[in-house]
């Protein structure tokens, strides 16, 4: 009977999770006569097979990364292999599952701030890329700071923005912070996917190397 | 060894029928179209039309849509071609041909019939 | 319908010479779907080259086919006795099938 996974030849979509062992067929395709036989063309990749009778599959499993649709055309040819319907166009939408761990660009990152600079506003930019979608949580990346060296009273001069990467100061940072103390920090720098809001989530961390420079401008004597 | 082998000549007045029949051996006789062909006197070859056995389906060429009729018997391997209203212009050696397996991906004329002579006069 | 034109219709030659004959097409056709037969007086057509290229069952190697879209060739290379015949292409790309009105090889 035709039903979910049966009927005539048609423009159709369907929506597949990357990274699954291919376990079940995608769709049996029903031939009206003259039509005996069916043909696969487009974007197969050796993955995608259709068997002469309309039995849609896919022989191995899927990856997002390397196409994240697949386009393909079935037609229906009768016993002298002359196309007789299609072809139709048949999409594999391939869906994302988060395989893939984020990266930074650099294990490490150098650079330098004056002192007493605005907070907030950034000085340094650490960036991470994951190849999994960013439209989904998988590729959703969550920046944030492990660990400040030296760490004084307890206090963070540092702050990070958790999605874009960004490096400032903080109020304390641009109140306290004085090369002639203190003239080098370091920062452990991690970035998580899943927008970091799972324990599923992969991560990657990074070194930030920040020297501190002398504000050499002075305040105008009354 | 393949074969198709072909009734023998005929000789027909104009306005009536001929049926020619092509048996075939040495394949399964299901997993094959069989299609038929004329070739006029001096002239070129011409195709009539094909029928695939396993389905009962039949396409003709439009110039001899109506006029012909294939058919096949499963039980004697047998095809047959039966073309009505003659005319002189029908005279000609009809062939039966068959391509390769129906699941195959290069399809020619692989077999042919030995041919069978029609001639139509008054 | 497909009109398949070849040339020449006829073409006296002798044993050992190198032939061409040309099939065009009137639409652009896949290679795959021309077909040349061969045909001596009295006898049933039988394949020579199928797909455009691949030598049919039995047929010798100085039998060669080539071309693409509307235009194809069938060449032999060095002619023998026994190929002075009538040579037809085919089209298998829609129906109805047709062929080429014919290529007559005659003995110089």
């Known amino acids: 009977q035709e039903g979910k996974f049966s009927g005539p030849l048609k423009p159709m979509t369907f929506s597949i999770y990357e990274g699954q062992e291919p376990s079940q067929i995608i769709f049996q395709f029903k031939a009206n006569p003259p039509a005996v036989t069916f043909e696969l063309t487009g974007e197969t990749d050796n993955i995608f097979v259709i068997e002469r009778e309309g039995l849609l599959y896919y022989n191995r499993a899927l990856d997002r990364e390397t196409r994240s649709t697949h386009n393909l055309q079935v037609a229906a040819l009768d016993a002298n292999g002359i196309i007789v319907e299609g072809p139709v166009p048949i999409t594999i939408k391939v869906k994302d599952i988060n395989d893939n761990r984020p990266t930074f660009l650099q294990s490490k990152y150098e650079g330098s701030v004056r002192q007493n600079s605005r907070p907030g506003k950034p000085f340094l930019y650490v960036n991470a890329t994951d190849l999994d979608d960013p439209a989904t949580p998988n590729g959703q990346l969550y920046y944030q700071i492990v660990i400040q060296l030296p760490m004084i009273n307890n206090v963070m001069y540092f702050q990070i923005n958790n999605k874009t990467g960004a490096i400032s100061l903080t109020r304390e940072g641009s109140q306290e912070l004085n090369p002639a103390k203190n003239p080098s920090y370091n920062l452990v720098i991690s970035v998580k996917d899943m927008g970091g809001q799972s324990e599923n989530s992969f991560s990657d961390t990074t070194s930030v190397d920040i020297i501190v420079t002398e504000n050499i401008w002075k305040a105008p004597k009354p | 060894q393949v074969q198709l082998v072909q009734s023998g000549a005929e000789v027909k007045k104009p306005g009536s029928s001929v049926k020619i029949s092509c048996k075939v051996s040495?394949?399964?006789?299901?997993?094959?179209?069989i299609h038929w062909m004329r070739q006029a006197p001096g002239q070129g070859l011409e195709w009539i039309g094909y029928?695939?056995?396993?389905?009962?389906?039949?396409v003709y060429a439009q110039k001899f849509q109506g006029r012909a009729t294939l058919t096949a018997d499963k039980s004697t391997s047998t095809a047959y071609m039966e073309l009505s209203s003659l005319r002189s212009e029908d005279t000609a050696v009809y062939y039966c041909?068959?391509?390769?397996?129906?699941?195959?991906?290069?399809?020619?004329?692989?077999?042919w019939g030995q041919g069978t002579t029609l001639t139509v006069s008054s | 319908d497909i009109q398949m034109t070849q040339s020449p219709s006829s073409l006296s030659a002798s044993v050992g010479d190198r032939v061409t004959i040309t099939c065009r097409v009137s639409s652009i056709i896949s290679s795959s779907k021309l077909h040349w037969y061969q045909q001596k007086p009295g006898k049933a057509p039988k394949p020579l080259i199928y797909g455009t290229s691949t030598l049919a069952s039995g047929v010798p190697s100085r039998f060669s086919g080539s071309g693409s879209g509307t235009d194809y060739t069938l060449t032999i290379s060095s002619l023998q006795p026994e190929d002075f015949a009538t040579y037809y292409c085919?089209?298998?790309?829609?129906?109805?099938?047709?062929f080429g009105q014919g290529t007559k090889l005659e003995i110089k």
């Open positions: 041909a068959r391509p390769p397996y129906y699941y195959s991906r290069n399809f020619y004329f692989d077999y």
């Open positions: 085919q089209q298998w790309s829609n129906y109805p099938f047709t």
């Open positions: 040495g394949y399964t006789f299901t997993d094959h179209t």
């Open positions: 029928i695939f056995p396993r389905d009962d389906i039949v």
